[in-house]
């Protein structure tokens, strides 16, 4: 899978002589609108209410450590995370839930109740969504928390469970 | 809270002359790009099916005016609403719908149906999102409906009801 | 609604000379910050687990053609899909799953199961959306399955099925 | 080292005005929200106002809602209470907070860094 | 306005204690709460930020927990210099607000 790298800062970026010298479509390319963005899917073994993901997945002008995806340009982003549950439901209802959070702050959560008929089913299936448009500070870490991390269906559908971020619009 | 106001039209950009002079990378930060978002919690009380927001929020380049976003700078705008409802069932089925309307028009809905079983339970949480992309005039409203408007979690999940709008592609 | 034709390739764009000669506003606003996106709602009338759109909606730099969006520009798009399901409940609980494919390959699922209770009642619904974050080359296409296409609510709400792309980041 | 200096105290008659400073220093000031706490002898915390790091999202407390103003000048590194119309029950030990967030949305994170605090008695 | 009700407003414990104070918000905050302490004649001092994240320098004998509203603050082994007042404080809206405080007072 794709792993990028963020070029020179535009304050770096040498618009006047070098190559591109007075062309303007070479100028414009280099130009300072910087984009940054992650799409990361959940790691196959989880085994605590932080998830983890696999680190192979895209990542441009955003770090992943521990479980954390780390924010390398301030501005603001679009977070986006889904994930898809299978529930062997048990005699009673289940609340799924599932927790954005910045630098350990909860900001958003979604919860879902299921096998609420209070019957042993064979199976459950439920997805579950959350987004959030935040401003992000350079260093921001942005983590997942699902209290009901063995209910996350990692082996039947293991690209369904992503943490996706990006740039909508710098801090320039 | 934060309410940005958007800088001149970029018909007003001094692109040449000022301080910018030749600086090309001056004239690119302050070329025509423009970006509008808006990013706003739902009221804390709810007493009709028109939702009210909280005009503290995220507003850039959008007003906020009697439940409705008024957009200021016609373009593409991808449009998401997402709600967090808890439904204490009584003794039949529920169905949670979420409107959002264009011009006091329906332009999209999401239904879900809760409480399925027909069993009076303690409490069942289910989240609602709908999203739109549409080109929006100057004075566009952008509104939400909610018939079900008492089965809205405010108090346990104030964060977690939300109105965002943001520019994908301004019109010119 | 609205279909839009894609200007010339931005290598043919004239930044020296022309009309545009010296103007830098003008020649901002032909800069090669390409956008390419689609919304599409579902066709009235489904028959296949393959669904198909209706090509009158919004189309930028993407066609459609037999059920497939085709991308025009290569680049990390951002696609999501949306449907509303209306379940006349057997006496079994239904899994409704939506697809995303890309290149016919499957690249995301979301999967809720409905009707749990088992018991018949008049009607469930159900919303269930998608969405990925994936770098597209050209001629790429992108489509929907649905196995149980003839829960999809085509009549009741015409306007909820949907199918949208975007384009995030060029490859430039 | 992270420091907040607070100025501006002292002893005025109810119905006057003060202007409270705070001097920061040791971290970037204009990327985090700042707060201002006060405490009455003998008495808890009380939260007085906060503002974003860009000014754009500011907050009071009910108590103090129309006659105190918070400002900040991110050149000089400097946070302000503006004190109009005191009351005796304005009384108290003025703090000046630095918060972990930017205030934006609501991003507040809790505080991190205390000044020592400057004290204000409202008395005829 | 959002309550903060601490409990209980002072207890007296020995060195060596085990000591838990609780702290609950009249309407859910998430994890959106910070504990702090503070001696007399000072400024009080940050110890604990996200109802459980340890502020850098505090030590691992103060933990935070809790999610919603409820929530506890607990110093597993009290030491002489933890005798103090603690108050919690939220700040997920305005207007922030604060425990009335718990007085910890040598036995």
């Known amino acids: 899978q794709r792993t990028d790298s963020i070029p020179n800062s535009p304050d770096n970026i040498p618009l006047r002589g070098g190559n591109c010298s007075e062309d303007l479509l070479c100028i414009l390319k280099r130009a300072p609108f910087k984009k940054s963005w992650a799409y990361l899917q959940v790691a196959k073994h989880l085994n605590k209410t932080k998830l983890s993901w696999n680190k192979d997945g895209i990542l441009h002008g955003v770090r992943y450590q521990d479980g954390n995806l780390v924010i390398q340009f301030p501005g603001l982003y679009f977070i986006i995370c889904q994930l898809q549950f299978l529930v062997q439901c048990p005699n009673n209802s289940v609340d799924l839930k599932l927790e954005l959070l910045i630098n350990k702050h909860i900001k958003k959560q979604a919860l879902v109740t299921v096998c609420e008929s209070g019957m042993q089913t064979k199976h459950v299936y439920q997805n579950l969504s959350q987004f959030l448009l935040d401003y992000l500070q350079v260093n921001t870490t942005v983590s997942v928390n699902v209290d009901t991390f063995q209910y996350i269906d990692t082996s039947t559908f293991p690209l369904e469970n992503v943490l996706s971020v990006f740039l909508y619009s710098n801090s320039d | 809270q934060r309410t940005d106001s958007i800088p001149n039209s970029p018909d007003n950009i001094p692109l040449r002359g000022g301080n910018c002079s030749e600086d090309l990378l001056c004239i690119l930060k302050r070329a025509p790009f423009k970006k509008s978002w808006a990013y706003l919690q739902v009221a804390k009380h709810l007493n009709k099916t028109k939702l009210s927001w909280n005009k503290d929020g995220i507003l850039h380049g959008v007003r906020y005016q009697d439940g409705n976003l008024v957009i200021q700078f016609p373009g593409l705008y991808f449009i998401i609403c997402q709600l967090q409802f808890l439904v204490q069932c009584p003794n039949n089925s529920v169905d949670l719908k979420l409107e959002l309307l264009i011009n006091k028009h329906i332009k999209k809905q999401a239904l879900v149906t809760v409480c399925e079983s027909g069993m009076q339970t303690k409490h069942v949480y289910q989240n609602l999102s709908q999203f739109l992309l549409d080109y929006l005039q100057v004075n566009t409203t952008v509104s939400v409906n909610v018939d079900t408007f008492q089965y809205i979690d405010t108090s346990t999940f104030p964060l977690e009801n939300v109105l965002s709008v943001f520019l994908y592609s301004n019109s010119d | 609604q609205r279909t839009d034709s894609i200007p010339n390739s931005p290598d043919n764009i004239p930044l020296r000379g022309g009309n545009c000669s010296e103007d830098l506003l003008c020649i901002l606003k032909r800069a090669p910050f390409k956008k390419s996106w689609a919304y599409l709602q579902v066709a009235k009338h489904l028959n296949k687990t393959k669904l198909s759109w209706n090509k009158d909606g919004i189309l930028h730099g993407v066609r459609y053609q037999d059920g497939n969006l085709v991308i025009q520009f290569p680049g990390l798009y951002f696609i999501i899909c949306q449907l509303q399901f209306l379940v006349q409940c057997p006496n079994n609980s239904v899994d409704l799953k939506l697809e995303l494919l890309i290149n016919k390959h499957i690249k995301k699922q979301a999967l809720v199961t409905v009707c749990e209770s088992g018991m018949q009642t008049k009607h469930v619904y159900q919303n269930l959306s998608q969405f990925l974050l994936d770098y597209l080359q050209v001629n790429t296409t992108v489509s929907v399955n649905v196995d149980t296409f003839q829960y999809i609510d085509t009549s009741t709400f015409p306007l909820e099925n949907v199918l949208s792309v975007f384009l995030y980041s060029n490859s430039d | 080292e992270v420091q907040l200096v607070e100025s501006g105290g002292g002893l005025v008659q109810p119905g006057r005005s003060l202007r409270l400073s705070c001097a920061a220093s040791?971290?970037?000031?204009?990327?985090?929200?700042m707060h201002w706490v006060r405490q009455a002898p003998g008495k808890g915390l009380e939260w007085v106002s906060g503002?974003?790091?860009?000014?754009?999202?500011?907050g009071y407390a009910g108590s103090v809602k129309g006659r105190f103003t918070i400002s900040r000048d991110n050149a000089k590194n400097s946070l302000y209470l503006q004190m109009n119309s005191l009351r005796p029950e304005d009384s108290a030990l003025y703090y000046c907070?630095?918060?972990?967030?930017?205030?934006?949305?609501?991003?507040?994170?809790?505080?991190?860094?205390w000044g020592q605090g400057t004290l204000v008695t409202v008395s005829s | 306005d959002i309550q903060m009700t601490q409990s209980p407003s002072s207890l007296s414990a020995s060195v060596g204690d085990r000591v838990t104070i609780t702290c609950r918000a009249s309407?859910?905050?998430?994890?959106?709460l910070a504990w702090f302490q503070q001696k007399p004649g000072k400024a009080p001092k940050s110890l604990i930020y996200?109802?459980?994240s340890l502020q850098s320098g505090v030590p691992s004998k103060f933990s935070g927990s809790g999610s919603g509203t409820d929530f506890t603050l607990t110093i597993s082994s009290l030491q002489p210099e933890d005798f103090a007042t603690y108050y919690c404080?939220?700040?997920?809206?305005?207007?922030?607000?604060f425990g009335g405080g718990t007085k910890v007072e040598i036995k």
């Open positions: 996200a109802a459980s």
């Open positions: 309407q859910g905050i998430s994890n959106h």
């Open positions: 503002i974003s790091w860009r000014s754009g999202n500011i």
């Open positions: 040791g971290f970037n000031f204009d990327d985090y929200a």
């Open positions: 907070a630095k918060d972990k967030g930017i205030g934006f949305n609501w991003n507040y994170e809790g505080f991190d860094y």
């Open positions: 404080q939220q700040y997920v809206t305005y207007p922030l607000t």
